[in-house]
Amino acid sequence: QLPPGKPEIFKCRSPNKETFTCWWRPGTDGGLPTNYSLTYHREGETLMHECPDYITGGPNSCHFGKQYTSMWRTYVMMVNATNQMGSSFSDELYVDVTYIVQPDPPLELTVEVKQPEDRKPYLWMKWSPPTLIDLKTGWFTLLYEIRLKPEKAAEWETHFAGQQTEFKILSLHPGQKYLVQVRCKPDHGYWSAWSPATFIQIPSDFIMNDEQKLISEEDLGGEQKLISEEDLHHHHHH
């Protein structure tokens, strides 16, 4: 029987800068029941606080609700593991909520094949930002990325969409069923998970063009830029 091993706080994430959760890995098992407690203080203060909510984030977690979350303040946190033989302490983790945002995936991804009479057909997609993110305040700039592939293909084709919530792509394989997904990230922070896949059947009469792909730079009404296949591969495939 031993004291518990040193725990490690390995991740903190916020969906929207209003709340956040941190998770730790327990240390090695000393062979006895072990209690974990997370304590924190705000940088520049000496008063230590205990985790307000050990439940919401699941096992080995601490959730900070709205009333405990401050923007523009750095949190300094540590996990203490204790059993009958003694205690161990994690390294301290410094957390600034601004830099740990991981939004929910974008919502309402709609995909359509557009076949205008006067232009080449294209795949058009549209989505909404995640509901928890308030874009009106200016606190957030969300960037989007789209990926698509034929249903049976192994490789995804990835496109960076910038801040726009609409996108169109030419040059798809006629007659194929495509999977399309979108994800987002704030300017400082982490990519969301991919949205659930949306399926779209490309008609057999869809005109294939291997030489170039048309990608909107702003919204659909804005300027459009012709990008060569080589440039596209360099800039947009991850």
């Epitope: 031993l2 004291p3 518990p4 091993g5 040193k6 490690e8 240390g27 090695t28 540590m78 003694g86 205690s87 161990s88 302490f89 994690s90 390294d91 301290e92």
Partner: antibody, heavy 120, light 107 residues
Framework: EVQLVESGGGLVQPGRSLRLSCAAS????????MHWVRQAPGKGLEWVSG????????GYGDSVKGRFTISRDNAKKSLYLQMNSLRAEDTALYYC?????????????WGQGTLVTVSS | DIQMTQSPSTLSASVGDRVTITCRAS??????LAWYQQKPGKAPKVLIF???SLESGVPSRFSGSGSGTEFTLTISSLQPDDFATYYC?????????FGQGTKVEIK
């Protein structure tokens, strides 16, 4: 520049007491845990005791438990080791060492040591 | 307490040699292991922490690896300044323990 300077060592008879001090400079003392490590002549390193930044947790090696007491005075940037009931096997060079964090990590700075000799 | 066992106790080597020192822990210590170098009459100096992270200012010929119970310190090309005694230390538990040391001497 981080500096740790130990003092208080000397020749003492078995059963008697001695108090070691470590004066710290060049860093914010109360941002770090501190430790005492000893080395008997010609032998390896042995962790003696440690204390976290706010004195909220203290630990001792098995060979000194109940006889030695570690303490710190953050205002004076000083670490202490009160050694009671000294034995011949406590003869060693005693180093003051800084933990690299406030709680439990490796030792990133060491003093040059103060020699304690327990002999009749 | 967790026991740390180093091997070999003494190692004879020449300048330019690749040198490996092993440290075994009696219990799993994750990656919470540090390596120190000590020269005669001097205080120890940290080389490696968290099993494989090089302390700032330490030459890149020193490297550490391992996790769990088995760890190694490697000196890729031994320099004259490297003849010293090396200690491993676990900090998985608050009660720290050191290995007994490995003396690297000139062959």
């Amino acid at each position: 520049e981080v500096q740790l300077v130990e003092s208080g060592g000397g020749l003492v008879q078995p059963g008697r007491s001695l108090r070691l001090s470590c004066a710290a400079s060049g860093f914010t003392f109360d941002d770090y845990a501190m430790h005492w490590v000893r080395q008997a002549p010609g032998k390896g390193l042995e962790w003696v005791s440690g204390i976290i930044w706010n004195s909220g947790h203290i630990g001792y090696g098995d060979s000194v438990k109940g006889r030695f007491t570690i303490s710190r005075d953050n205002a004076k940037k000083s670490l202490y080791l009160q050694m009671n009931s000294l034995r011949a096997e406590d003869t060693a060079l005693y180093y003051c060492a800084r933990d690299s964090g406030r709680y439990q990590s490796y030792f990133d700075y060491w003093g040059q040591g103060t020699l304690v000799t327990v002999s009749s | 307490d967790i026991q740390m066992t180093q091997s070999p106790s003494t190692l004879s080597a020449s300048v330019g040699d690749r040198v490996t020192i092993t440290c075994r822990a009696s219990h799993i210590i994750s990656s919470w292991l540090a390596w120190y170098q000590q020269k005669p009459g001097k205080a120890p100096k940290v080389l490696i922490f968290k099993a494989s992270s090089l302390e700032s200012g330490v030459p890149s010929r020193f490297s550490g690896s391992g996790s769990g119970t088995e760890f190694t310190l490697t000196i890729s090309s031994l320099q004259p300044d490297d003849f010293a005694t090396y200690y491993c230390q676990q900090y998985n538990t608050y009660s720290r323990t050191f290995g007994q040391g490995t003396k690297v001497e000139i062959k």
